[in-house]
Interface confidence: medium
């Protein structure tokens, strides 16, 4: 065989022409349109990319590689068919006209052709391991993408539901805001009014000061002439004693002796027959100093001295030590009798101490103890009590053991500060202890939160500053 | 003198608990409130809790709530503070102080210091 | 909480000569009764906490008046008006005015 040549007809079938001597042979076989040849093979990208493909171009590319694959396989199977009958065939007419040597060449060509049929579904083979390759490739590239897209999705609504919600709150402090500047300026303007009001009250207080000035001024005056007066009245008053003690000494001797008794507290002005509260003169024990107290004639019973008082503000009790042993203010009013007098008063004989408070809603307390004295100076005016009875409060709220008494410039409490000089006022602080009815006093819708206003805690609490407070003193076997 | 003393050092095991005691001397204990501070190494004093010796009140640290309890025995003038949980950043030293008030538990000052105790954290 | 802001961290001293220290509270320790309720603490190496001013500027008992405490609502500060070796150590403020009680980071003065 000469020759053996290969061409296309005009129906596009693929034809195998051997021409052998005089004789020629032809073979036509079908060809697929889609089949790649093998000269370009389909090459996928080498490289993994961060960003998914786009989903339907990898799907289209699936679909081609599948059809390609399937179509491959017809043509396979059509082929085999082809060569099959057309064998038959050819081997029929051969053997029934070749000759001898025609018949080698025919088996030479069948040869050829099984040859060439077995490279060709080699080839496809191959091309089908390809396809199967790429196929599990683009799948496993396909189920990244999918979860790459899943979790983008799922961020990207994640966001979105975060930039609604920050959206709402914007809008929400936004509207907080604005209503905050509209508040801001309503005080502002409430503010001003209140400045404005204020200064007018600062100019009449001003002026009212003035005048009061003058009427000090005035009154200090009248007040040195009165002392004046006072003074001659009392020269007056202890010469006419005087003539009468002479006079009368001689005809009644009970006088003098009624004359030279003097009281040591309330409770014996009270034996005596006085029975009208008010302000006496009581002497020192073994002593004849003298010292003005109040005596209360009237509540249980009578007989009280009283030894503190507040009622209004207008005694400063934020004093020295000397001041407190000596006692200070005004007896009918508010006042401190002294801590000298009391200290020797409760040493002479057993006294009960009764502390009466009222607060500003009008509600009134008492804690009364049964046994009550103070220690002398060195021992700092000390405090002792015992037998707690009363409505204010089940404890003391004078801390037991008592403590010594400590003023601004006597500080002897329990305190690495300076109680007296925190709180105000001369007490028996601890650190600085649950009462203090020496201090700040403080009017009205002014009286609470103030750690150093006139505090007894286990009536009315830590901050509560009360409206009057009295604390009297009178013997246990009254 | 007033003074407070406070139980020896104590090595414990991550959660575990510990119990502090502060014996209190030469002052009213029942008048006042008890403190609870505490230091860790090279950091700054950190406030735990304090406890009103009187009536027995408490108020804790919102960050050791739940974890911290303080108790007081007042026959025997002593507070205790119990931190249970315990971890290695609980190694610190414990201080009790004593509180100035204006009665009623609101301090405004620590007067009086224990000597501290220090507590170790290790497994 | 209340945030205590202490500077410096550290402060060299030289004997005889004036320090100060800076506490700063992220809010008013300004309390309606008019006292400010910050103190100071120093803490001496081994040694426990000890109250030097309290309220802002009232020096506890004992405390040398070399130590002054000032300042009002948010920002205080401390002074030694003549450092002397036994003032080394490191000072803490506090802020007393709510709960949980808070201190500053501290200060350490060491002579130079």
């Known amino acids: 065989y000469n020759n053996f040549r290969k061409s296309m007809d005009s129906i596009g079938k693929k034809q195998y022409q051997v021409q052998h001597g005089s004789c020629s042979y032809t073979f036509l076989l079908p060809e697929m349109d889609n089949c790649r040849s093998s000269s370009s093979p389909y090459v996928s990208n080498a490289v993994q990319r961060d960003a998914p493909l786009e989903y339907d171009d990898s799907v289209q590319r699936l679909q081609v590689l599948e059809n390609i694959m399937e179509n491959n396989t017809q043509w396979l199977m059509k082929l085999e068919n082809y060569i099959q009958d057309n064998m038959k065939k050819e081997m029929v007419e051969i053997q029934q006209n070749a000759v001898q040597n025609q018949t080698a060449v025919m088996i030479e060509i069948g040869t050829n052709l099984l040859n060439q049929t077995a490279e060709q579904t080699r080839k496809l083979t191959d091309v089908e391991a390809q396809v199967l390759n790429q196929t599990t490739r683009l799948e496993l590239q396909l189920l990244e993408h999918s979860l790459s897209t899943n979790k983008l999705e799922k961020q990207i609504l994640d966001q979105t539901s975060e930039i609604n919600k920050l959206q709402d709150k914007n809008s929400f402090l936004e509207k907080k805001v604005l209503a905050m500047e509209d508040k801001h300026i309503i005080q502002l303007q409430s503010i001003k009014e209140e400045k404005d009001q204020l200064q007018v009250l600062v100019s009449k207080q001003n002026s009212i000061i003035e005048e009061l000035e003058k009427k000090i001024v005035t009154a200090t005056v009248n007040n040195s002439v009165l002392q004046k007066q006072q003074h001659d009245l009392m020269e007056t008053v202890n010469n006419l004693l005087t003539m009468m003690s002479t006079s009368n000494s001689a005809k009644d001797p009970t006088v003098a002796k009624e004359e030279q008794i003097s009281f040591r507290d309330c409770a014996e002005v009270f034996k005596s027959g006085h029975t009208t509260n008010g302000i006496y003169t009581l002497t020192f024990p073994n002593s004849t100093e003298e010292i003005k107290a109040y005596c209360d004639m009237e509540a249980g019973g009578g007989g009280w001295t009283i030894i503190q008082r507040r009622e209004d503000g207008s005694v400063d009790f934020q004093r020295t030590w000397k001041e407190y042993k000596v006692g200070f203010g005004n007896p009918s009013g508010e006042y401190w009798l002294g801590n000298e007098f009391v200290s020797q008063l409760t040493n002479q004989q057993r006294y009960v101490l009764k502390i009466h408070l009222k607060d500003w809603e009008g509600n009134e307390a008492y804690s009364l103890y049964e046994h009550f004295y103070l220690s002398s100076e060195e021992l700092n005016y000390r405090i002792h009590l015992k037998g707690l009875t009363g409505t204010a409060g089940k404890i003391s709220s004078i801390s037991q053991p008592g403590n010594d008494f400590s003023t601004k410039d006597g500080d002897n409490d329990k305190c690495i500060c300076k109680c007296s000089q925190m709180l105000t006022g001369g007490w028996w602080f601890d650190a600085c202890g649950p009462s203090n009815l020496n201090g700040m006093y403080y009017p009205q819708r002014q009286n609470t939160n103030k750690f150093n206003g006139i505090k007894w805690y286990y009536w009315k609490g830590s901050g509560y500053s009360l409206k009057a407070t009295t604390m009297m003193i009178r013997p246990a076997d009254f | 003198q007033v003074q407070l003393v406070q139980s020896g050092a104590e090595v414990k095991k991550p959660g575990a608990s510990v119990k502090v005691s502060c014996k209190a001397s030469g002052y009213t204990f029942t008048s006042y409130a008890m403190h609870w501070v505490r230091q860790a190494p090279g950091q700054r004093l950190e406030w735990m809790g304090w406890i009103n010796a009187g009536n027995g009140n408490t108020k804790y640290s919102q960050k050791f709530q739940g974890r911290v309890t303080i108790t007081r025995d007042t026959s025997a003038s002593t507070a205790y503070m119990e931190l249970s949980g315990l971890r290695s950043e609980d190694t610190a030293v414990y201080y009790c102080?004593?509180?100035?008030?204006?009665?009623?538990?609101?301090?405004?000052?620590?007067?009086?210091w224990g000597q501290g105790t220090m507590v170790t954290v290790s497994s | 909480d209340i945030v205590m802001t202490q500077s410096p961290l550290s402060l060299p001293v030289t004997p005889g000569e004036p320090a100060s220290i800076s506490c700063r509270s992220s809010q008013s320790l300004l309390h309606s009764n008019g006292y400010n309720y910050l103190d100071w603490y120093l803490q001496k190496p081994g040694q426990s906490p000890q109250l030097l001013i309290y309220?802002?500027?009232n020096r506890a008992s004992g405390v040398p008046d070399r130590f002054t405490g000032s300042g009002s609502a948010t920002d205080f500060t401390l002074r030694i008006s003549r450092v002397e070796a036994e003032d080394v150590g490191v000072y803490y403020c506090?802020?007393?005015?709510?709960?949980?009680?808070?201190f500053g980071g501290g200060t350490k003065v060491e002579i130079k």
């Open positions: 309220l802002g500027s």
């Open positions: 102080a004593r509180g100035v008030d204006d009665y009623g538990g609101n301090s405004w000052a620590f007067d009086i």
């Open positions: 506090m802020q007393a005015l709510q709960t949980p009680l808070t």
